[in-house]
């Protein structure tokens, strides 16, 4: 629960949040996600770093790996083999991009309590995983895939053509990692470990982004990344499957691409194993409004994979792009051919559908003016999913169970009434066969993780309730938060307002708009956070508002696809509209309004500042996109089409920040970027700065040397301190 607010006599014992609190993470919370290893067992790393196995049914727990063993190789992560004979220990973690990293791996033999010697793994490894059954290993080293029958065996090399920045096997290149797969891996074991599927990405023809990494040497290093910007040559992807028992028999077999996809540029979007001999691949045209789901079967006689046209399912959007942020993935039922999938219904809301033969004959499972967000698990008799249906708040998430074994199927909200005030935003983690599950509540109160019986939904125990955090917050004057909506011209704008602790409607407060606003994003969520904006409200007396305008998610396709092919227009308009409505509320000092955002939010904040409305006194853009021609093809083209004359070049040119350089003359602008940003390249801010200089417009800027898109470590402290000074100066608040 949010700690109860104490008033009057006790109020003087309460203190406001400080910036130091935020930078030190004093009020961060913990979650508990069980590492499930069976229907009733899970692993968890204890406070003293032992790896402990818990059996829910016996109530017993025992240490399977001591902290001493972990420490002996400086392990920061572990993975138990499904046959429970081995554990891999991961150390020397070295981050690459958002998901990818390399590490050194040691294999510990639980049967004899020793590390496996002989045929040790090479280092550093780019990805490693156990087979789903037994203790086979697949790993990627120097862009090639290797297989081990058992940890002590010599490896079998599956691919030979891997080359840095050229050919990637079993791992994605930059753009697939960031914008399509959202993983560090691109290989998938079949359910019993018979086959291994993998992607090969050929980046040979992709233009390279190069930037300096200054380091400490006399000469800076140059970082080169094959990075396709909008309209550029894309990676060429191929999917292969190899028999892991007889890998040399016929070697890797390529899975055919559906003809309607292969006729022009395309993407591979995901792979889902159905059985050991049936696999489902999803493909997407480069113009991302057509997706094809293809179910392929192993032909024993030819040792090949057959993908009949009758098992191709097409998903097409006529009003926008296919899917939400990504095209949804199927969850197969026990018959191994029919599946459940989320896509838009006839009313333009994303809902669960059951597909047995064709998409046209799909049976709609959920419906209403709300959206199904995620399918967690399908069992013989139940389907568990999350949605924002409850009480019509799009920024909430509750977990539902639909009984699919009975007709008509009955629906039950598992979480809606558990801790109604404290918990309105849930996710879940299920054990095998959904025998048990963990619920993780993110707010709006203090987060709590609980364990539940999968049949009765009964709470078994609290896994993490953040008691220390609750106690620490008892003497803190937290801001008030409210989530409400504005109705403007048939558009519903949900907003979250963060108000100073002693908020008084009759007074005037400076307003800071925090914006992200990217397609299929959601900022107005019922989650707990004690962060920088909490401090700005608590200590500095600012009102902070977050607004979900057109282009944002989970409120239907009309709102979501409104920005299709027109990025940078309606997102900005809706922030401005909301600000005008906030002014009308009477407690905003209209001479002290600011806007800030990061990444896409930096783009929107820049455009809002340059909108010429006179509403904003100042604003901050952190690592902004400045022209869609500078950003990644996969992301950009999904929403904008191609930057060609016969497609959408005109709007690419019209939607740049640089084109509005003149309009920054009457605002205070702080532009911030990391020089080693692999995602939104420093180029974006360099071009804004150049345009402002050429227009003789004064502005403030800060770069962070050798920092990426996250501006982490010491840069974070410097960044928030710097932005705080800037805002306080803008709002004439004493330091």
């Amino acid at each position: 629960l949010r700690p109860s607010r104490v008033h009057n006599s006790e109020e003087n014992t309460m203190r406001a949040l400080t910036l130091k609190d935020i930078l030190n993470g004093t009020f961060s919370y913990k979650t508990f996600f069980p590492n499930w290893i069976s229907g009733q067992e899970y692993l968890h790393q204890s406070a003293d770093n032992n790896i402990v196995l818990y059996n829910i049914e016996t109530g017993q727990s025992y240490t399977i790996l001591s902290n001493r063993t972990m420490k002996s190789v400086n392990a920061s992560n572990y993975g138990l083999s499904p046959d429970r004979q081995f554990v891999y220990l991961e150390s020397d973690y070295s981050k690459l991009w958002r998901y990818s990293y390399t590490a050194t791996y040691y294999i510990y033999d639980l049967s004899n309590g020793e590390f496996v010697r002989g045929n040790e793994l090479p280092r550093p490894i780019q990805y490693l995983c156990w087979s789903p059954v037994g203790s086979k290993l697949a790993y990627v080293y120097q862009n090639n895939i290797y297989l081990k029958q058992r940890p002590g065996d010599p490896p079998f090399q599956i691919t030979f053509n891997g080359r840095e920045n050229k050919i990637f096997n079993g791992i994605p290149d930059w753009v697939y990692e960031e914008e399509m797969l959202a993983t560090k891996y691109a290989l998938w074991w079949s359910p019993n470990g018979k086959f291994l599927a993998y992607a090969e990405f050929n980046d040979t023809d992709i233009p390279v982004i190069a930037y300096s990494y200054y380091g400490d040497e006399q000469y800076p290093r140059t970082i080169n990344i094959p990075y396709p910007k909008a309209g550029a040559k894309n990676p060429v992807v191929r999917i292969f499957i190899i028999d892991t028992t007889y890998p040399a028999y016929v070697g890797p077999q390529e899975v055919p691409v559906p003809a309607m996809i292969a006729s022009s540029d395309y993407y591979f979007s995901w792979l889902t194993w159905v059985t050991d001999e049936r696999v489902c691949l999803q493909w997407l045209k480069r113009v991302q409004n057509v997706s094809v789901l293809s179910i392929c079967d192993f032909r024993e006689d030819w040792q090949t994979w057959d993908c009949p046209k009758t098992q191709e399912h097409i998903e097409e959007s006529r009003t926008g792009w296919a899917g939400g942020f990504f095209v949804s993935t199927p969850v197969f039922s026990y018959d191994a051919i029919s599946y459940y999938k989320i896509f838009s219904d006839k009313d333009g809301y994303k809902h669960i559908h059951y597909i047995k033969d064709t998409v046209e004959n799909a049976i709609q499972i959920t419906s209403g003016k709300w959206e199904a967000i995620n399918i967690f698990r399908v069992t013989q008799d139940s389907l568990f999913y999350s949605s924002n249906e409850f009480e019509e708040y799009p920024g909430r998430r509750n977990i539902y169970r639909i009984s699919i074994g009975s007709y008509p199927p009955s629906k039950k909200c598992v979480t809606c009434h558990l801790r109604k005030e404290r918990c309105q935003y849930y996710t879940a983690s299920f054990s095998d066969y959904a025998k048990y599950y963990a619920l993780v509540c993110y707010g709006p109160g203090i987060p709590i993780s609980t364990l539940h019986d999968g049949r009765t939904d009964q709470e078994i125990k609290i896994l993490e309730e953040n008691k220390e955090l609750e106690n620490a917050l008892k003497n803190i004057q937290l801001p008030k938060e409210e989530i409400k909506k504005l109705e403007v011209d048939e558009i519903t704008l949900w907003y979250k307002m963060i108000l100073p602790p002693q908020f008084d409607r009759s007074k005037k407060y400076p307003l800071l708009i925090q914006v992200y606003g990217g397609p299929c994003s959601q900022s107005v969520r019922s989650v707990f956070a004690v962060n920088w904006i909490s401090y700005l409200a608590s200590k500095e007396g600012m009102v902070i508002a977050l607004v979900d305008g057109r282009g944002t998610a989970f409120q239907g396709d009309k709102l979501l696809y409104a920005v299709y092919r027109k990025l940078g227009v309606y997102e900005v308009e809706d922030q401005i509209t909301a600000v005008r409505k906030f002014i009308e509320m009477g407690f905003i000092d209209e001479k002290r309004i600011a806007i800030w955002g990061w990444s896409y939010g930096g783009y929107v904040s820049s455009l809002a500042l340059a909108s010429g409305t006179g509403l904003f006194k100042c604003g901050i853009a952190v690592a902004p996109v400045s022209s869609w021609e500078y950003y990644a093809s996969v992301y950009t083209e999904r929403f904008m089409g191609l930057p060609t004359k016969d497609d959408n070049l005109e709007h690419y040119k019209n939607s740049t920040v640089m084109a509005r350089a003149e309009y920054f003359r009457n605002v205070d602008y702080l532009l911030i970027h990391g020089t080693a940003d692999d995602n939104v390249h420093f180029q974006n801010s360099a071009q804004i700065a150049k345009a402002l200089v050429n227009a003789q417009v004064d502005f403030q800027a800060m770069w962070y040397s050798d920092q990426n898109h996250g501006l982490s470590g010491l840069s974070t402290n410097h960044l928030y301190t710097h932005m705080t000074h800037f805002l306080k100066q803008c709002f004439s608040l004493s330091d």
């Epitope: 029958q149 079998f156 030979f160 028992t245």
Partner: antibody, heavy 118, light 107 residues
């Protein structure tokens, strides 16, 4: 330590039968392809047969197809070779070997001699 | 079936010599080529797998190279314990075949 120990060899008349056994230890037997390789006196190595980890798939050299049958009992960690209709040219030392990835023979037994003679 | 041809069938060499044995496949076998050492009355022993990977415990004086159809086993400095017969072997299409062997004798 991986160990493979063959047994069952001996003298048999042409047309006769013999069953070879190979007891495996020191590794997870049920996880590997196993094989028989033979070597006639003073000659080179000749692969005879292989069997998949679970025992459902087998392969045979043309020279023994239809006469020899490979099998395994994973509960006993034992590999077998049933040899029927034996011929003089089947005389050889028979080695039990682990066929890793169906590609290379990484561990071998010491061999058992089969002599087919009248 | 794929035929494997080894050459020479025998060779005489002295301790410390560099010895090279070649193996040719009748069709491409990628890098699925292995080398074994066999001493009289003993079982063969794996030396090199996948054309160039040294089996654990095998001295580093042994090395393998090649891909496609032509492969080589090299002993960089022959030791007394290396006098033996060497076999190459392939296993594409799950039909393993061996070369006829190369006998390395003391000069």
């Amino acid at each position: 330590e991986v160990q493979l120990v063959e047994s069952g060899g001996g003298l048999v008349q042409p047309g006769g039968s013999l069953r070879l056994s190979c007891a495996a230890s020191g590794f997870t037997f049920r996880g590997y392809i196993m094989s028989w390789v033979r070597q006639a006196p003073g000659k080179g190595l000749e692969w005879v047969s292989w069997i998949s980890p679970e025992g459902s798939r087998t392969g045979y050299a043309d020279s023994v197809k239809g006469r020899f049958t490979i099998s395994r009992d994973n509960s006993k960690n034992t590999l077998y070779l049933q040899m029927n209709s034996l011929r003089a040219e089947d005389t050889a030392v028979y080695y039990c070997a682990r066929l890793l990835y169906g590609t290379w023979f990484d561990y071998w037994g010491q061999g058992t001699l089969v002599t087919v003679s009248s | 079936d794929i035929q494997m041809t080894q050459s020479p069938s025998s060779l005489s060499a002295s301790v410390g010599d560099r010895v090279t044995i070649t193996c040719r496949a009748s069709q491409s076998i990628s890098s699925y080529l292995n080398w074994y050492q066999q001493k009289p009355g003993k079982a063969p022993k794996l030396l090199i797998y996948a054309a160039s990977s040294l089996q654990s415990g095998v001295p580093s004086r042994f090395s393998g190279s090649g891909s496609g159809t032509d492969f080589t086993l090299t002993i960089s400095s022959l030791q007394p314990e290396d006098f033996a017969t060497y076999y190459c072997q392939q296993a594409t299409l799950l039909l393993p075949t061996f070369g006829q062997g190369t006998k390395v004798e003391i000069k």
